[in-house]
Interface confidence: low
């Protein structure tokens, strides 16, 4: 079927459309082109013989129409007037005519809109404006943006006048924005300038900064305010109700108690002829004195005296802070506040009560803090220490003590040997000892200030010859793969070898076995039951030697998987069942049965005589040993035979 | 028709107490071991530990011995089991179950108590 | 504790089909292997008792076998309702203990 396809459809003022055939007929004699929807020779456009390829002119051609051999027709430099219908008339050689019609619309170019408004300066919550988008133009769509977005739903806000017309009804200030409209049609799309729209609004109520409302006497006054207006506002300054400049910030030096007072802020806008004003009072203190500790007692004794310390001066309605050791004060039954905080009383003082201790005085403004106090609080002596630790020593040797007791003041230190003063010094020594300086040695620590005396006595053994030792244990019963046992030779003596048997063997190389302590220490980690042996110290010198007596190391091991005898599986009816249950376990392990998951006896040896089929069924041994905690079991299924079977025996 | 039915649900926060309960029908209640087992979200299932009901002996878990006491009630036919000391990982599905073939077979179980620990 | 080791630990498959699940045990348990089924309700049963025992009322799809420290549940032809999750447990030794479970899922 022959078609008419117009390329544009929409066609711009100025432009070009191309009236494009389709399906156009074989054996052709010509054709002609009519403006309209009908073949009517008066508007007749063009007509063409395909024999001559002769284009002959109608009464409806502009001069701007150009006809293809294909039939198609161009029409250039379109007008307004040439939107419409056209109809193509074909006429085939056999004279049969066929006809088609197109169409096309033609639009004008749209020029740049502008935006009027009808008040350019709207107050807020007062005004509404009205912008409508300029020129006026038939057939084109209007469209609104706002901050390049398309407008909010609001319902202040308001389209008119086929959308040309944008109204803001109860203007605010988030209004203030960047309006801008679109004019659209078929063939072209323009987009205004950006008109802002200035919202006159304010003043808010000022805000005066800083916020505190605090000063001591001396300081520097600066305030500042400012209140969100349009345009911006003016200020004035009112203090106590007097005027004082028109500035947005006022500056007082060197302030007194008497510029105490209500500060006012008042903020004006012209254009919206509004006045807004904040008060804040303003409060001058005098500096207040710097706080400072007395205490009723200076040289405490430990666990005997109080000591009160007072925070001074007193002032009234103040509130006094305390500090220890740069903390507050910790929660403690020895520490005690007066009901007002001034004195904090440290009853029965340890030496760990030295502090530094402050108190502080809070004002309005900060917190005033006095100097550190340092408690000298007298203790000891404690008893004193002796070193070195030594208890035998060869003859011909020096013989060097240390005594030391923490003690404040430091103790003062006496030597007795076997009960004799020998000197008041904190070190004895004594060259080239002999068997005669054998004896009890006694450190006496003396405090002066608080009259306590402590002693410690060590004796002194001086022989070519050593003793025999002896080996002390740190655990008697250890238990197996959990804990370790360390082995200690007594006594310590000087310049002495240490040595160690196991079943009278030396040292076995192990990952487990540890030396320390000069060899005097032999530590076994994780026990094993083999680890049960007899174990001997030894201690020699250049002179002598000798051997402890073993000491056996009992371990607490098991109870193992135990094993059911005898290995039996299947028995005749009538046969006594007698089960022995053996578990390796150090103690003895305890015993007991299950037939069936139903307890039995607590015995090693489950009897039961003349079986049946009923006995049929899973025979559980139970083992538990106290001492380690531990618990272990074994099953066995036992199958009973109807006597006249003979079934074969299974283990 | 043996039944195991046990108590609801529980919330309880760390460091509390929690007793669920296990009451037992269908069967000579005295004459069968009941067990105790718990199932973490996700997770397997963990022996807790058993209690014959005729003279009230027990065995635990190890590791729930400090955690867990399980008692019986043989006038209502009831098992209960005591955790304390309750922490987050605690939480879990406790679930009761007969033993009823020796050798701890687990022939009927009860359908399960769901116990959230959390602050 | 007697470790056990379950594999695999989850499985997809189709009705009709056979499927076999282990359990390797860390030490012999004689036979005291244990077979149990749970639904995602939570509901728990048990299966196969002391190996090969076939709880009465179980289905004959469903089968135990093994010794010594290495066990098998086997379902000769996997029904709808068999879609759930296996356990298999000891009981030789104290404590009772559980292998980790085999999800069977639907293909």
């Known amino acids: 079927k022959l078609t008419i396809e117009s390329t544009p459809f929409n066609v711009a003022e100025g432009k070009e459309v191309l009236l494009l055939v389709h399906n156009l007929p074989q054996h052709l004699f010509g054709y002609s082109w009519y403006k309209g929807e009908r073949v009517d020779g008066n508007r007749q456009i063009i007509g063409y013989v395909i024999g001559t390829q002769q284009a002959t002119p109608g009464p409806a051609y502009s001069g701007r129409e150009i006809i293809y051999p294909n039939a198609s027709l161009l029409i250039q430099n379109i007008i307004q007037n040439d939107t419409g219908f056209y109809t193509l008339h074909v006429i085939k050689s056999d004279l049969v005519n066929e006809e088609a019609t197109g169409q096309f619309r033609v639009y004008p170019e749209l020029p740049k809109p502008s935006i009027s408004s009808n008040n350019s300066k709207p107050v807020e919550d007062k005004d509404a404006v009205a912008f409508t988008c300029e020129p006026e133009t038939q057939d084109a769509t209007y469209l609104w943006w706002v901050n390049n977005q398309s407008l909010p739903v609001s319902p202040r806000l308001q389209l008119s006048n086929g959308n040309r017309t944008l109204t803001l009804f109860n203007v605010t200030r988030n209004d203030t924005a960047s309006y801008k409209c679109e004019t659209q049609n078929p063939v072209s799309a323009r987009r205004s300038d950006s008109v802002i729209l200035n919202v006159l609004y304010g003043p808010d109520a000022p805000t005066i900064s800083p916020l505190n409302t605090s000063y001591r006497s001396g300081e520097n006054l600066n305030l500042s305010c400012h209140a969100a207006s349009n345009p911006p506002a003016q200020y004035s300054w009112f203090v106590n109700g007097t005027f004082q400049q028109s500035t947005q910030e006022l500056f007082i030096p060197n302030i007194t108690v008497n510029n105490s007072g209500s500060y006012t802020c008042q903020a004006h806008n012209s254009d919206t002829g509004l006045n807004r004003t904040t008060v804040t009072t303003i409060t001058v203190y005098a500096e207040p004195p710097k706080p400072f500790i007395t205490s009723n007692n200076s040289n405490p004794v430990e666990d005997e005296d109080a000591v009160a310390l007072t925070c001074e001066p007193e002032i009234q309605n103040t509130t006094y802070l305390w500090w220890v050791n740069n903390q507050s004060l910790p929660v403690s039954p020895r520490l005690q506040l007066s009901n007002d905080n001034r004195t904090l009383t440290l009853l029965s003082v340890t030496r760990n009560d030295v502090g530094p201790y402050e108190c502080g005085i809070q004002n309005e403004l900060s917190v005033d803090h006095s100097d550190p106090v340092i408690l000298n609080v007298l203790y000891g002596p404690d008893d004193p220490t002796i070193s070195p630790s030594y208890t035998y020593y060869r003859p011909g040797v020096n013989l060097s003590l240390s005594c030391h007791a923490a003690s404040n003041p430091p103790a003062q230190y006496s030597w007795l040997i076997d009960g004799n003063i020998q000197q008041h010094t904190q070190e004895l020594f004594i060259s080239n000892i002999t068997e005669k300086n054998s004896g009890l040695y006694t450190c006496q620590a003396n405090n002066s200030a608080s009259g306590h005396s402590r002693t410690t006595v060590k004796t002194i053994t001086v022989s070519a010859e050593l003793p025999k030792p002896s080996i002390s244990s740190n655990n008697s019963k250890p238990v197996e793969d959990k804990d370790a046992v360390a082995f200690t030779c007594e006594p310590e003596a000087q310049n002495t070898t240490y040595l160690w048997w196991v079943n009278g063997q030396s040292l076995p190389v192990s990952p487990r076995l540890q030396l320390s302590n000069g060899n005097r220490t032999l530590t076994l980690f994780n026990v094993t039951r083999n680890d049960a042996r007899a174990y001997v110290c030894g201690i020699q010198n250049s002179v002598s030697a000798n051997r402890s007596d073993p000491v056996t190391l009992d371990v607490l091991y098991g109870p193992d998987t135990p094993i059911i005898s005898p290995p039996d599986s299947s028995y005749l009816s009538g046969a006594n069942l007698n089960l022995s249950c053996h578990s390796a376990s150090n103690p003895s392990p305890q015993y007991s049965w299950r037939i069936n998951g139903i307890p039995q006896q607590h015995t090693q040896v489950l009897f039961i005589a003349k079986i049946t089929p009923n006995n049929n069924g899973t025979y559980a041994c139970f083992v538990s040993n106290l001492a380690t905690g531990r618990n272990n079991s074994i099953v066995k299924s036992i199958t009973v035979s109807a006597s006249g079977t003979s079934p074969g025996l299974s283990a | 028709e043996v039944q195991l039915v046990q108590s609801g649900a529980e919330v309880k926060k760390p460091g509390a107490s929690v007793k669920v309960s296990c009451k037992a029908s269908g069967y000579t209640f005295t004459d069968f071991y009941m067990n105790w087992v718990r199932q973490a979200p996700g997770q397997g299932l963990e022996w807790i530990g058993d209690i014959f009901p005729k003279n009230g002996n027990t065995d635990y878990n190890r590791k729930f011995k400090d955690k867990a006491t399980l008692t019986v009630d043989k006038s209502t036919s009831t098992v209960y089991m005591e955790f304390r000391s309750l922490r987050s990982e605690d939480t879990a599905v406790y679930y009761c179950?007969?033993?009823?073939?020796?050798?701890?077979?687990?022939?009927?179980w009860g359908q399960g108590t769901l116990v959230t620990v959390s602050s | 504790d007697v470790q056990m080791t379950q594999s695999p630990s989850s499985l997809s498959a189709s009705v009709g089909d056979r499927v076999t699940i282990t359990c390797r045990t860390s030490q012999d348990i004689n036979i005291y292997l244990n077979w149990y089924q749970q639904k995602p309700g939570g509901a728990v049963k048990l299966l196969i008792y002391?190996?090969?025992g076939l709880l009465s009322g179980v289905p004959s799809r469903f089968s135990g076998s093994g010794s010594g420290t290495d066990y098998t549940l086997t379902i000769s032809s996997l029904q709808p309702e068999d879609f759930a999750t296996y356990y298999c447990q000891q009981g030789n030794t104290l404590p009772p203990t559980f292998g980790g479970g085999t999800k069977v899922e639907i293909k």
């Open positions: 179950a007969r033993s009823g073939y020796g050798n701890y077979v687990f022939d009927y």
């Open positions: 002391y190996r090969s």
